[in-house]
């Protein structure tokens, strides 16, 4: 059973991560960002079901994508270069959901521009995080 | 009803520049952009580039780099594009068109460029 | 420099479904946008984001996109579908917009 640091670790985690997504949706979703119209033309897949931390499984698969639509936007949208931000969300990520058990990520048929995909899991953190407290 | 009305055709001699303006109505100017594409006679359609219509910001096609420029007036909700040292290969019917992201909601009604002015033919000619 | 490729022309009767094809590299990470373009006239955008519809559309046109190759789909095609269409996207780092070259939908 968890333990309430194990919760609290989980949860500042949770909250580092919902940082870093809403970081990024503001930096896209910008007057400033004169590359948006571009930015809109990726597609990145999306979880049919999130409801759990291994299921961050889907999100760690899409990092790559989310990285090389980053590299577009101008670095003064955001605080850190795209790779060292996708480096730490990384990071999060592979602690939330763990690496001791294998969890194949199924996708939703439709794809999903960088604005859904993000408001898609910052909502999933949102989630989380609200069943911790 | 969203429009955009742009400017009369224009012919220009080698080496000169032309300036097409497009007019915004119908909805609220500065929270979308407005792409420029254009299409020589008889041949497919070619992007130029983009402007804010909020803040001005630009992103210009690579061939069209130094030699466009797109600006924009708020207070008639018009935008322009200027495109200079103008060569025969330049003639072609000009368009604006809006992009359907709505900046800061953080959604749209549909991306791409969802509504066209009806295009402004530019002769290059000498 | 990036390229989308989409037949020249396509001949359907009335009726019967028209489909245009769009490949590129690019297209199993980028979505395609289909435009439609009568003699003369503004294109009219029928197709964003592989398979949505704008308002305003007739529900015979739908898109669809599997690895690199987009299409867009006429069911029951009629004689004012006859037009230029055009599709659209991104190159794989996104720096570069590019419109096929267009195809001729002919409904005899």
């Known amino acids: 059973a968890p333990t309430s640091s194990s919760t609290k670790k989980t949860q500042l985690q949770l909250e580092h991560l919902l940082l870093d997504l809403q970081m990024i949706l503001n930096g896209i979703n910008n007057y400033k960002n004169p590359k948006l119209t571009r930015m809109l033309t990726f597609k990145f897949y999306m979880p049919k079901k999130a409801t759990e931390l291994k299921h961050l499984q889907c999100l760690e698969e899409e990092l790559k994508p989310l990285e090389e639509v980053l590299n577009l936007a101008q670095s003064k949208n955001f605080h850190l270069r795209p790779r060292d931000l996708i480096s730490n969300i990384n990071v999060i990520v592979l602690e939330l959901k763990g690496s001791e058990t294998t969890f194949m990520c199924e996708y939703a048929d439709e794809t999903a521009t960088i604005v859904e995909f993000l408001n898609r899991w910052i909502t999933f953190c949102q989630s989380i995080i609200s069943t911790l407290t | 009803e969203v429009q955009l009305v742009q400017s009369g055709a224009e012919v220009k001699k080698p080496g000169a520049s032309v300036k097409v303006s497009c007019k915004a109505s119908g909805y609220s100017f500065t929270t979308y952009g407005i792409s420029w594409v254009r299409q020589a006679p008889g041949q497919g359609l070619e992007w130029m580039g983009w402007?804010?219509?909020?803040?001005?910001?630009?992103d210009y096609a690579q061939k069209f780099q130094g030699r466009v420029t797109m600006t924009k007036d708020t207070s008639t909700s018009t935008v322009y594009m200027e495109l200079r040292s103008l060569r025969s290969d330049d003639t072609a019917v000009y368009y604006c068109a809006r992009d359907g992201y709505h900046y800061g909601s953080g959604s749209y009604d549909n991306a791409g460029f969802d509504h066209w002015g009806q295009g402004t033919l530019v002769t290059v000619s000498s | 420099s990036y390229e989308l490729t989409q037949p020249p022309s396509v001949s359907v009767s009335p009726g019967q479904t028209a489909r245009i094809t769009c490949s590129g590299d690019a297209l199993p990470r980028k979505f395609a946008y289909w435009y439609q373009q009568k003699s003369g006239q503004a294109p009219v955008m029928v197709i964003y984001?592989?398979?949505k519809r704008p308002p305003g559309i007739p529900e015979r046109f739908s898109g669809s996109s599997s690895g690199t190759m987009a299409t867009l789909t006429i069911t029951g095609a009629q004689v004012e579908d006859e037009a230029d269409y055009y599709c659209y996207s991104t190159d794989s780092g996104g720096d570069v917009s590019v419109f096929g070259g267009g195809t001729k939908l002919t409904v005899l």
């Open positions: 402007i804010s219509a909020h803040n001005g910001n630009t």
């Open positions: 984001e592989d398979s």
